[in-house]
């Protein structure tokens, strides 16, 4: 039961950085995406501000804060209509994430 090269362990995620040269000289675009191999009953989500496999029922009910999406010490609050969540740092700075 060894993993093949490039294969993710079940229940884990990795961040994939896509580099591509733009048509403009000396400008490089970088974008990040997550690759997850989630177990049965799980779905790709966010835990501690990183990609993670989370309980699929959290996504179904839109109880986003149940993913523990914020860093430890930050407060999580649902956006109105459960369209996403906010993470509030101890200093008061707020980071908002919306789910499309």
């Amino acid at each position: 039961q060894f993993l093949k090269e490039g294969q993710l362990a079940a229940g884990t995620c990795e961040i994939v950085t896509l580099d591509r040269d733009s048509s403009q000289p000396r400008i490089e675009e970088r974008s990040q995406t997550a690759r997850c191999a989630c177990r049965k009953g799980q779905i790709a989500g966010t835990t501690r501000a990183r990609p993670a496999c989370v309980d699929a029922r959290i996504i179904k009910t839109k109880q986003w804060c149940d993913m523990l999406p914020c860093l430890e010490g930050e407060g999580c609050d649902l956006l109105i209509n459960r369209s996403g969540w906010t993470c509030t740092q101890p200093g008061g700075r707020i980071k908002t994430t919306t789910v499309s």
Epitope: G11, K40, Q63, C65, C70, E72, G75
Partner: antibody, heavy 113, light 107 residues
Amino acid sequence: QSLEESGGRLVTPGTPLTLTCTASGFSLSSYYMNWVRQAPGKGLEWIGIIYPSGTTYYAGWAKGRFTISKTSTTVDLKITSPTSEDTATYFCARTVSGYFDIWGPGTLVTVSL
Amino acid sequence: ELDLTQTPPSLSASVGGTVTINCLASEDIYSALAWYQQKPGKPPTLLISGTSNLESGVPPRFSGSGSGTDYTLTIGGVQAEDAATYFCQGYSSYPLTFGAGTNVEIK
């Protein structure tokens, strides 16, 4: 960062009992909180878990026998109708990924006439 | 429902020796396995998560391995303070499940 359970005592069978878990040094809303018990000289039994929203999941044997609830500062475990089989040390423990990184010292519940 | 069979139930080891404890899962748990140490009158303490990830502050003589349904905790160069009961725990799905425990005595 620590957890502490309270409320354990000698109760008569059928008398509901509520145990309380209090966290120090971290916010309960940033973790999944669990209750685990251990009968004298026996192994560990997971009772259930509560999410920040209040969503709960229980072990099959624990459904109907226990209720987990929370406030902003505590997590409670209610033993609805204790029997002698519920005599045990009850621990609260926190998790993010399914394993328990911090445990309370435990509180002893004795059910006897 | 996941069942974890932990063997042996108890063992005796000499200081400096090696201890091996096994945990057999009734189904593939995809390396979602943790190990705990518990001493009398105390709560368990986490030693290893994710089959082989040593917790901060845990001596390197403790190690974990395995995959699929078979997992092992090894204590190399056993010390007197390692006398305790050891539990495995699976967390691939609910309900979270513990093995029955292995009591380790040091001679």
